[in-house]
């Protein structure tokens, strides 16, 4: 994929609210492009933070503007929905909300949308088409929860048109305007440590592969051209530079360690993958 | 800077016809739902129609459901009204306004004036 | 449908006066009220949106409240320009409704 992320791909924003007791609540909101955060919320100004050069798309000032009220008047329509119906729905204090909404692109085209509300953690409610509907596991709260949010059905063909309508329009002027910077392409450094020792007589070989951009990445410990199945790759964690790291261990006797190698294929190397041999391993690739 | 111009107002005679534009720019028109609100001579406010951006949701008033028809052309930046069977009690000024997302009418026309007589 | 009330349906005031004009909704509402100035052979011009919030432009001494069903427009100065009809509108259902209508008069 040229933009370099992972088709397919989504725009989404998350609203994160927490009701410590009747008076006393918090709000975090944020906007991801897939696993890239562009945006965020300033509560005390009550505006759209944009956190890349290109986070505006192609959207006008008016139209930023506009959201900006939208965001600020909703927050406060749903905290005052909340606290009032908190009882009702046997909302227990302290708990917490999360609201996810977006709208997924494939090969250049919208392939639909989502807005999800989990209560406690645990999915409660999503919104299909024109309407929010329950989820059957999560009862009859869910169930009088989208008869209270069904109320407003102007509303409900908003939120619809915000979905489908303003979020792709959206996410393509995003990908636009920030083209060369997901397009770009930047290398992997990797180096070797010693990781905490797994018993007597065995090593844990960490390869650690930081700073590259796109995410996609391919690590393995190698014997020769033989991968070893005992790899155990974490999660892809983002750096504060919007690049990625990854480690790959393997749990080895240490008799064991001298022939193996540490592999890294990534798009920015063009082929030339980083190989790195355990028995000098001060290298860095 | 927002304008939203009509047109299309004028004299007809009951069961007539007419049809209303408006012509809207200074804002991306293709993201805002949009509404016709009407006044009768000396009256109060009355809401008519209903369009959603790309024209997937609409709503009519009762007095008018079957007779107007709502629609848009968002390449173009019009929003039109088309009346058939018109009645005296149609007589009234048309305004096209434009809809915010927490649902406001934020800008309105200037209004064009229907009178249905005979 | 939702029906709105305003209360007074007109109301002589002086420059400097404080003018507060009523409505009242048949049932709740939450927020979801606006707030229109109209002047004679003009278009409605939205003041107050989502029952207090004013609208960008629109002098300071405008402000709403209320919340559920009863809302209040007030004018903590009346000016001369602000002599007009003034009409309260919700957005909670559709079909959307305003209210009948407060004019405000020079006494």
């Known amino acids: 994929n040229a933009d370099g992320l992972k088709e397919p791909l989504s725009f989404h924003v998350t609203w994160i609210a927490s009701f410590y007791n009747h008076s006393w609540k918090q709000n975090l909101v944020s906007g991801w492009l897939s696993d890239l955060q562009t945006h965020t919320w300033d509560s005390n100004s009550s505006t759209i933070v944009f956190l890349c050069p290109w986070s505006r798309g192609n959207f006008s000032n008016e139209e930023w503007k506009e959201l900006e009220t939208l965001f600020r008047i909703r927050t406060i329509r749903s905290f005052e929905g909340i606290r009032r119906y908190a009882h009702e729905l046997q909302f227990e204090y302290p708990f917490e909300i999360q609201v996810t909404g977006g709208c997924e692109l494939h090969s250049g085209k919208v392939s639909g949308s989502f807005l999800q509300l989990a209560y406690q953690g645990s999915d409660f409610v999503s919104f299909q088409n024109n309407s929010w509907l329950p989820y059957p596991v999560a009862g009859n709260m869910a169930k009088h929860f989208c008869k209270v949010l069904n109320q407003n059905q102007h509303e409900n063909d908003i939120t619809h048109n915000l979905l489908s309508d303003t979020c792709p329009r959206f996410i393509l002027g995003l990908l636009d305007a920030g083209k060369a910077h997901l397009q770009r392409q930047v290398k992997p450094e990797a180096w070797l440590s010693h990781g905490p020792s797994p018993g007597p007589g065995h090593l844990q070989l960490v390869c650690h592969v930081s700073g590259f951009y796109p995410k996609p990445v391919w690590v393995m410990w190698m014997r020769g051209e033989q991968e070893q199945q005992g790899t155990q790759r974490g999660d892809i964690l983002p750096s504060a530079d919007g690049t990625w790291y990854l480690r790959a261990t393997l749990e080895v006797a240490a008799g064991e360690a001298a022939d193996l190698s540490c592999r890294v294929k990534h798009s920015s190397l063009e082929g030339q993958d980083i190989v790195l041999y355990w028995e000098h391993h001060s290298s860095v690739g | 800077e927002v304008q939203l111009v009509e047109s299309g107002g004028g004299l007809v005679q009951p069961g007539g016809s007419l049809r209303l534009s408006c012509a809207a720019s200074?804002?991306?028109?293709?993201?805002?739902?949009m509404n016709w609100v009407r006044q009768a001579p000396g009256k109060g406010l009355e809401w008519v129609s209903y369009i959603s951006s790309s024209s997937s949701t609409i709503y009519y008033a009762d007095s008018v459901k079957g007779r107007f028809t709502i629609s848009r052309d968002n390449a173009k930046n019009s929003l039109y009204l088309q009346m058939n069977s018109l009645r005296d009690e149609d007589t009234a000024v048309y305004y096209c306004a434009k809809e915010t997302w927490w649902q406001s009418f934020d800008y309105w026309g200037q209004g064009t004036l229907v009178t249905v007589s005979s | 449908e939702i029906e709105l009330t305003q209360s007074p349906s007109s109301l002589s005031a002086s420059v400097g006066d404080r003018v507060t004009i009523t409505c009242r909704a048949s049932q709740s509402i939450s927020s979801y009220l606006n707030w229109y100035q109209q002047k004679p052979g003009k278009a409605p011009k939205l003041l107050i949106y989502a029952a207090s919030s004013l609208q960008s432009g629109v002098p300071s001494r405008f402000s709403g409240s209320g919340s559920g069903t009863d809302f209040t427009l007030t004018i903590s100065s009346l000016q001369p320009e602000d002599f007009a009809t003034y009409y309260c509108?919700?957005?909670?259902?559709?079909?959307?409704?305003f209210g009948q209508g407060t004019k405000v008069e020079i006494k």
């Open positions: 509108q919700q957005s909670y259902s559709t079909p959307p409704t």
């Open positions: 200074g804002f991306t028109f293709s993201s805002y739902s």
